[in-house]
Interface confidence: low
């Protein structure tokens, strides 16, 4: 089933031993096989609506884990569970997020409970933060430095979520979802309410639409932590990541003053932001303005998570505290440091879902249907998962982001790593420190790594033993095809040279550009035959890369060039007669049409522009049905067509001036335009750099009217694919021999 293959992909196959038909308490004492692990289920840690969390021990290594067992009897719940697993896997590896280990499922057909069963394995934490805080209460208030460390580490976890593309919103941040690791650091858990969906209510929203959104959000949030924009949807404030900032403000207040700012969850007080900082507090004054900045009624006035983290860093610097360090003062209160197991007393009392210790997995009440399904489960999935099932399950094992400490480095396969820019100086406090990166790579892959810098910025290649390839391209552009092909060929040659060799790819943030290169390389090595599958793997191993349609198009070109029946790009020039947009896009201030002009680039050179004086450019109205820009330009190679809307503005001295607004852009390679083509069609989802959806009518498409010249016009230099053999390309090269 689709569901099973999704979980197979996420974790490698897992069989649920012989546990399937037992009730939850019978599960204790059983042995469960999960991937490579054989787990003895030791005891119940917590339970909720239809989920139990157990302490489990790997029979082989003796290592302890938290094992969450979920039962589901409907498809919607299944999808919600998969979404939670996907979020966990995507976010896992960050030092302040509970480490995902594995997941597996069996369908209701094989289970004698008559329900689908899911197992989710994570690291076992020492306990819930609230338990440790309760034990410390007798000693008086927390020190300012303890609050700083707890809160900073919590914010770092949320920052990791908000940095994803699209951002992941937790929606249920509360102290109960903070765990303390064995090392004494904060770990955020429970992604059962998380979403990537933001809402932008406005006056046009009907009461019914508001009610639906409100109902879905209410199901996924905790009353005390609900935000003004959620409680009063008619305020028309955006509902997005700033929900989490409000909740963090509540957490900071609670850590400081030992009570919640909205203890009673009174809607009126929340909507009006009516809370008060204890007037005589002098201990936590350093946090007062931060609390106020996070508990702003208007979400747009709240700080972003980046700003919160940076302000906390400044407080930490002023107080000479390392905010990332373990909160040992909490552990010292609780029977020594770093023991892996909880006290052996009776299990904690069972409360409602989400209460009690969950060992890395908070329990979500899944009994109600869930909203916000995972993007990849919408359309096109069968093909995607079929592709993935065809690959060895060992290929897709989980390798954590943040391979060492705080380094932002992710292994896409055991021989391909992606990281953010290795920075020097003060900048390295926010990004990968180049020295730390080198130390890490030198210790993990001594003499066997090559670095591929896809960013426009450079550093001394000697930092990485002169094994640095500078192969960047312009931001917000697809790479030139020959550049992309050369990167793939070079990486392949390096991996082939020695089985210990690895490729380390980076752009600025290790996202879009890195994803294009790495996904192209996965396809080049024939691990995948579609861009979609490659991009999905990248998303799971690192983060959703936020790439544009043209980026995907160029990855597809790579798939075509190495296919069993390869498509080699032809060398025929193309005459672009005109750009035709149907229906007319709505970019004028009155939303009645547009006044378009066009720029054409070949490679990095602008070869044509239809821009003229404002009045000489035609104004197209909706009733025209289509907007046509005559071009008559011959192109060959990598082409970028940018379409602008011309706007009249009054300049200084009341002179008419023209402002331009980008409507969209298209990037493609002429070598893949079929030889007999007269029209090249681009749907709305094929266009880059689009504006808000309302400006493009339904079924909007762009057609290039073209004519392919019959004769080849070879370029001065033969393209790299011409003298390149596609034989011997094998996905095995992407993995170390032991895999």
């Amino acid at each position: 089933s689709l569901l099973q293959s999704a979980l197979d992909f996420l974790a490698g196959p897992g069989s649920l031993g012989g546990a399937s038909g037992r009730d939850q308490s019978d599960f204790v004492g059983q042995t469960v096989e999960l991937g490579e692990l054989r787990l003895r289920v030791r005891r119940v840690l917590a339970e909720g609506g239809f989920a139990f969390v157990y302490e489990a021990q790997d029979v082989g290594s003796g290592r302890e884990y938290a094992l969450k067992r979920l039962l589901s009897n409907e498809e919607e719940k299944n999808r919600a569970i998969i979404q939670e697993v996907c979020f966990m896997k995507k976010l896992s590896g960050h030092p302040n997020i509970v480490q995902f280990c594995s997941a597996a499922s069996i369908g209701k057909e094989e289970s004698d409970t008559g329900q689908a069963e899911f197992l989710l394995l994570t690291e076992l934490c020492k306990g819930q933060l609230v338990e440790f805080l309760k034990k410390m209460e007798s000693r008086g208030p927390l020190s300012c430095d303890t609050v700083l460390k707890i809160f900073y580490q919590t914010c770092r976890a949320v920052q990791h979520m908000h940095r994803q593309k699209p951002p992941i919103i937790h929606r249920d941040l509360k102290v109960e979802n903070l765990l303390l690791s064995n090392q004494g650091t904060i770990k955020l858990c429970d992604f059962g309410s998380a979403t990537t969906i933001s809402h932008y209510p406005d006056y046009s929203w009907s009461a019914q639409r508001r009610a639906l959104v409100e109902e879905e959000i209410t199901r996924n949030t905790t009353p005390m932590y609900r935000t003004p924009e959620i409680i009063d949807l008619y305020s028309n404030f955006p509902i997005g990541e700033k929900q989490d900032i409000w909740a963090l403000g509540c957490i900071l207040y609670l850590l400081c003053f030992r009570q919640h700012p909205f203890e009673d969850g009174a809607k009126l007080r929340i909507v009006n932001g009516k809370y008060s900082i204890p007037p005589h507090d002098t201990q936590y004054t350093v946090f007062h303005s931060l609390i106020r900045a996070m508990l702003q009624v208007n979400p747009e006035e709240r700080l972003s998570i980046a700003e919160v983290v940076h302000q906390l860093q400044e407080i930490a610097a002023a107080r000479n505290v390392n905010p990332k360090s373990p909160i040992t003062e909490l552990l010292e209160q609780n029977g020594g440091y770093g023991s892996a197991t909880l006290s052996r007393g009776p299990p904690p009392p069972v409360g409602p879902a989400g209460s009690g210790y969950s060992g890395g997995l908070a329990l979500a009440e899944y009994d109600q249907p869930y909203g916000g399904f995972l993007d990849i489960l919408r359309g096109g999935t069968e093909r995607l998962f079929t592709n993935l099932k065809d690959t060895s399950s060992k290929v897709i094992q989980s390798v954590a982001n943040y391979a060492k400490g705080d380094l932002d480095i992710s292994y896409i396969t055991s021989r391909i790593a992606v990281m953010s820019f290795p920075a020097e100086g003060v900048e390295s406090a926010l990004k990968n420190n180049i020295e730390d990166v080198r130390l890490f790579l030198d210790s993990k892959h001594p003499g066997h790594y090559a670095v591929y810098n896809l960013s426009p910025r450079t550093y001394r290649p000697s930092r990485f033993h002169n094994r640095v390839s500078e192969c960047g391209w312009a931001a917000r552009r697809a790479p030139h095809l020959h550049t992309l092909y050369n990167i793939c060929r070079n990486m392949h040659a390096w991996l082939r040279q020695d089985h210990k060799n690895v490729c380390v790819v980076h752009c600025m943030d290790g996202r879009a550009a890195s994803a294009v290169a790495v996904c192209s390389f996965l396809c080049f090595c024939r691990l995948f035959s579609t861009a979609e599958a490659a991009v999905y793997m990248f998303s799971m191993k690192r983060c959703p890369p936020g790439i544009w349609p043209s980026h995907k198009r160029y990855i597809e070109y790579m798939c075509d060039m190495v296919a069993e029946e390869p498509i080699t790009p032809h060398s025929k020039p193309i005459l672009v007669r005109a750009v035709v947009m149907t229906p007319v896009p709505l970019f004028s201030k009155q939303r009645s049409g547009c006044r378009p002009f066009c720029e054409v680039y070949v490679g990095d050179e602008r070869v044509a522009s239809t821009s003229q004086e404002y009045d000489k450019m035609r104004d197209f109205k909706i009733e025209d049905g289509k907007a046509v820009i005559p071009l008559g330009v011959t192109v060959q190679g990598d082409v970028l067509i940018v379409i602008y809307h011309a706007r009249s503005t009054l300049g200084g001295r009341l002179q008419a001036k023209m402002a331009s607004m980008k409507m969209f852009q298209i990037q493609f390679h002429t070598g893949f335009v079929p030889r007999n083509a007269t029209t090249v069609k681009f749907a709305k989802y094929d266009l880059d750099a689009c504006d808000i959806q309302e400006k493009y009518p339904d079924l909007f498409q762009v057609n290039l009217e073209v004519e392919v010249e019959p004769r080849d016009r070879p370029s001065r230099e033969a393209p790299p694919w011409e003298n390149s053999s596609m034989r011997g390309l094998n996905p095995k090269i992407l993995f170390s021999s032991r895999e």
Partner: antibody, heavy 117, light 107 residues
Framework: EVQLLESGGGLVQPGGSLRLSCAAS????????MSWVRQAPGKGLEWVSS????????YYADSVKGRFTISRDNSKNTLYLQMNSLRAEDTAVYYC??????????WGQGTLVTVSS | DIQMTQSPSSLSASVGDRVTITCRAS??????LNWYQQKPGKAPKLLIY???SLQSGVPSRFSGSGSGTDFTLTISSLQPEDFATYYC?????????FGQGTKLEIK
């Protein structure tokens, strides 16, 4: 010893632009926030703008919002204030100061900006 | 915006006098108040932060008190070098407004 040295002031016409710089030394520049404060001739102090250690957080007085931009280059230990659409009322001595989260603990000697036709 | 009102706007006193300057905020600012001293042609100097904390290197004759909306700066025994203009400043998020200043002159 902490030192802050402003430069870039001078005479400019209304509507014109000017860029002030503040070179910092004697402390870890990238470790904390920085601010600009101004003082019109014979008048009191007016806070203008602040920036967090990384440059992510920027804050402006209403009187300059949309016209002034604060920025910093931590590799050069330098703070900047880009002032556009200058008005006569922007005439002042501009001080850069280290922003110790809630207070301004070290100040430069100031640079005079005169906006006049 | 939060308005800061200092009083008096000017004050004459003699060496050895005890002097008090007050500052009132238009709304509660907890203890987010700082005091600065400025001499003619010079940059301001931080004296007191967080209403009552003495900045290092500042003589102990300077002290600050208050919270909420009413604050005072006290110089217990005026010295010749203390004749200057004094400013209060609120640092309650997010705009850091100053009082109009109090000029302390030799009687």
């Amino acid at each position: 010893e902490v030192q802050l040295l402003e430069s870039g002031g001078g005479l400019v016409q209304p509507g014109g632009s000017l860029r002030l710089s503040c070179a910092a030394s004697g402390f870890t520049f990238g470790g904390g926030g920085m601010s600009w404060v101004r003082q019109a001739p014979g008048k009191g102090l007016e806070w203008v703008s602040s920036i967090s250690s990384s440059g992510y957080g920027t804050y402006y007085a209403d009187s300059v919002k949309g016209r002034f931009t604060i920025s910093r280059d931590n590799s050069k230990n330098t703070l900047y204030l880009q002032m556009n659409s200058l008005r006569a009322e922007d005439t002042a001595v501009y001080y850069c100061a280290r922003w110790g989260w809630s207070y301004l603990d070290y100040w430069g000697q100031g640079t005079l900006v005169t906006v006049s036709s | 915006d939060i308005q800061m009102t200092q009083s008096p706007s000017s004050l004459s006193a003699s060496v050895g006098d005890r002097v008090t300057i007050t500052c009132r905020a238009s709304q509660s600012i907890s203890s987010y108040l700082n005091w600065y001293q400025q001499k003619p042609g010079k940059a301001p100097k931080l004296l007191i932060y967080a209403a009552s904390s003495l900045q290092s290197g500042v003589p102990s004759r300077f002290s600050g008190s208050g919270s909420g909306t009413d604050f005072t700066l006290t110089i217990s025994s005026l010295q010749p070098e203390d004749f200057a203009t004094y400013y209060c400043q609120q640092s309650y998020y997010p705009l850091y407004t100053f009082g109009q200043g109090t000029k302390l002159e030799i009687k």
